[in-house]
């Protein structure tokens, strides 16, 4: 004997995030007479997704109209879909009763599936900074993505790493997909202008995949190299001593010169100079008084850079070499911001 | 008052694809309101209902040719289509067009004068 | 498929006569019936919808009864234009399917 079929055509419908997916159903009867109902899921727990008799299901628009008394298509429309509405969906025949309504066959169901694009990749580095010839880690994580098949590169200034480790997760079934990958990166000197990149390949993304970056000027930190070195003879007894401060990153940097290991000034780098591979030089100097002082004079210059400690270099300042001048122990005119006298 | 008019060619070759056009004029087809459908009458026999198809594209074919049957609309021309593949012999028949009433009058209620289609080498 | 069984297949009958033509469905169909009219070289036409509704604009002379798997479509004084074969088709079930039909003639 012939009966009702509820027929759902199509076994799985793949949709992108955002748009619309239509889930098809045909009765091949209008007996018994009764009203069409769409679920998510089956048994006890299934949601209820649309019904023709009763409700508000402002998602849900109808392919047909179902008011026609010789309407068989009770196919839907869901909008604006989202990885959450990923299940699978049965249309179910209803049986007109009394007082209830009576299940009377269902469709063998329809699995949605979301397509959804991976949110831009936020990579991030080490929460301190590196000093060249170490190897630094570099964390990249994209989320909300389906299907879960996906493709992750790292580079660094275009050339492709090979030292990183990718999870992907959940490991299950999920309706949508996060993305967690660590590089490791060796800097060198070279690296304040250089950049680590991570690209993200997706069925989502036809061919143009989404990339994070990170500078590595705010990973890398190039300790500066130092270098006293004594001026000739400004006038008879003045001596201008420079302590040259060279290749280094970032800029913040403080310099302190000692005299025979005392304090003589402090002062903080301003008008540097900047190299092609992004480092600073810069340069302080000291005008010293040399008839001020019976014995030889140390001099310090003292580094401090980007909160690290101190690095030093010192230089020896002969006084022998220099007549002494009676009454000359009065201070000499300064004659530069970066000039002072050693009484 | 909506008019039915089935075009194309009277003949075809056996394993070829009959293709069929139907015109409707006087009333829109994506209206929503009527099923749009293909009937047959092989010479001298009765009616053998095809299919229909629904403005929204909904289609539903007879399974005893569900598998070389195909019904398209293209309501930009106000236009329904069949599509019968490897035709034999037992293909031969006078094809109508004819629109179905989804409210009021159910039936069918407006049809094309048919087209004899030959399926011959 | 819903098979319809017509019959008779062909009956003659003078003008003035009451005709019957009966429609057997192989299950219920409810009302779900329609009846044609289809003359020689001639499209189909409605006559009669869900098993007993006339059509806009066809003669009186022409009804329909029956529910459930037994059908009757009367003509109660039989025109010599009323000469045709006569289908019932039901839409209860897809596919929609046709009965035999039956020859209508003037004797």
């Known amino acids: 004997e012939e009966e009702l079929q509820v027929i759902q055509p199509d076994k799985s419908v793949l949709v992108a995030a955002g748009e619309t997916a239509t889930l098809r159903c045909t009765a091949t009867s209008l007996i018994p007479v009764g009203p069409i109902q769409w679920f998510r899921g089956a048994g006890p727990g299934r949601e209820l997704i649309y019904n023709q008799k009763e409700g508000h299901f402002p998602r849900v628009t109808t392919v047909s109209d179902l008011t026609k008394r010789n309407n068989m298509d009770f196919s839907i429309r869901i909008g604006n879909i989202t990885p959450a509405d990923a299940g699978t969906y049965y249309c179910v025949k209803f049986r007109k009763g009394s007082p209830d309504d009576v299940e009377f066959k269902s469709g063998a169901g329809t699995e949605l599936s979301v397509r959804a694009k991976p949110s831009a990749p936020v990579v991030s580095g080490p929460a301190a900074r590196a000093t060249p010839q170490h190897t630094v880690s570099f964390t990249c994580e994209s989320h909300g993505f389906s299907p879960r098949d996906i493709t992750l590169k790292w580079f660094k200034n275009g050339n492709e790493l090979s030292d990183f480790q990718t999870n992907v997760d959940p490991v299950g079934e999920s309706v949508s997909y996060s993305i967690h990958s660590t590089a490791k990166v060796v800097l060198t000197r070279e690296d304040v202008h250089s950049q680590v990149i991570c690209e993200v390949a997706h069925v989502t993304l036809q061919g143009d995949p989404l990339r994070g970056t990170a500078n590595l000027s705010e990973t890398i930190r190039v300790p500066p190299t130092l270098e006293v070195t004594q001026q000739p003879v400004r006038a008879e007894n003045q001596v201008n001593v420079t302590c040259q401060v060279r290749k280094f990153y970032p800029q913040r940097l403080q310099l302190t010169w000692l005299e025979n290991g005392n304090v003589s000034r402090t002062e903080t780098a301003s008008t540097v100079t900047e190299n092609k591979d992004g480092t600073y030089n810069w340069m302080s100097w000291l005008l010293v008084n040399v008839s001020a002082h019976r014995d030889d004079v140390k001099l310090t210059c003292q580094v401090e850079h980007d909160g690290q400690p101190a690095v030093s270099k010192s230089h020896d300042l002969k006084v022998s070499a220099h007549p002494k001048e009676q009454g000359s122990n009065t201070a000499a005119e300064n004659t530069g911001s970066n000039e002072r006298n050693i009484y | 008052q909506v008019q039915l008019q089935e075009s194309g060619p009277g003949l075809v070759k056996p394993s070829q694809t009959l293709s069929l056009t139907c015109t409707v004029s006087?009333?829109?087809?994506?209206?929503?309101?009527?099923?749009w459908e293909w009937i047959r009458q092989h010479p001298g026999k009765g009616l053998e209902w095809i299919g229909y198809?629904?403005?929204?594209?909904?289609?539903y074919y007879n399974p005893s040719l569900k598998s070389r049957v195909t019904i398209s609309v293209d309501t930009s021309k106000n236009q329904f289509s069949l599509k019968l593949s490897s035709v034999t012999a037992a293909d031969t028949a006078v094809y109508y067009c004819?629109?179905?009433?989804?409210?009021?009058?159910?039936?069918?209620?407006?049809w094309g004068q048919g087209t004899l289609v030959t399926v011959s080498s | 498929d819903i098979q319809l069984t017509q019959s008779p297949s062909s009956l003659s009958a003078s003008v003035g006569d009451r005709v019957t033509i009966t429609c057997q469905a192989s299950?219920?169909?409810?009302?779900?019936l329609n009846w044609y009219q289809q003359k020689p070289g001639k499209a189909p036409k409605l006559l009669i919808y869900?098993?007993?509704n006339l059509e806009t604009g066809v003669p009186s002379r022409f009804s329909g009864s029956g529910s459930g798997t037994d059908f009757t479509f009367t003509i109660s004084s039989l025109q010599p234009e009323d000469i045709a074969t006569y289908y019932c088709?039901?839409?209860?079930?897809?596919?929609?399917?046709f009965g035999g039909g039956t020859k209508v003639e003037i004797k």
């Open positions: 004819a629109r179905e009433g989804l409210d009021g009058s159910y039936g069918s209620s407006a």
């Open positions: 006087g009333g829109s087809i994506s209206s929503g309101e009527y099923y």
């Open positions: 088709q039901q839409f209860a079930y897809l596919p929609y399917t």
């Open positions: 299950q219920d169909i409810s009302n779900y």
């Open positions: 869900d098993a007993s």
């Open positions: 198809i629904y403005s929204s594209g909904f289609t």
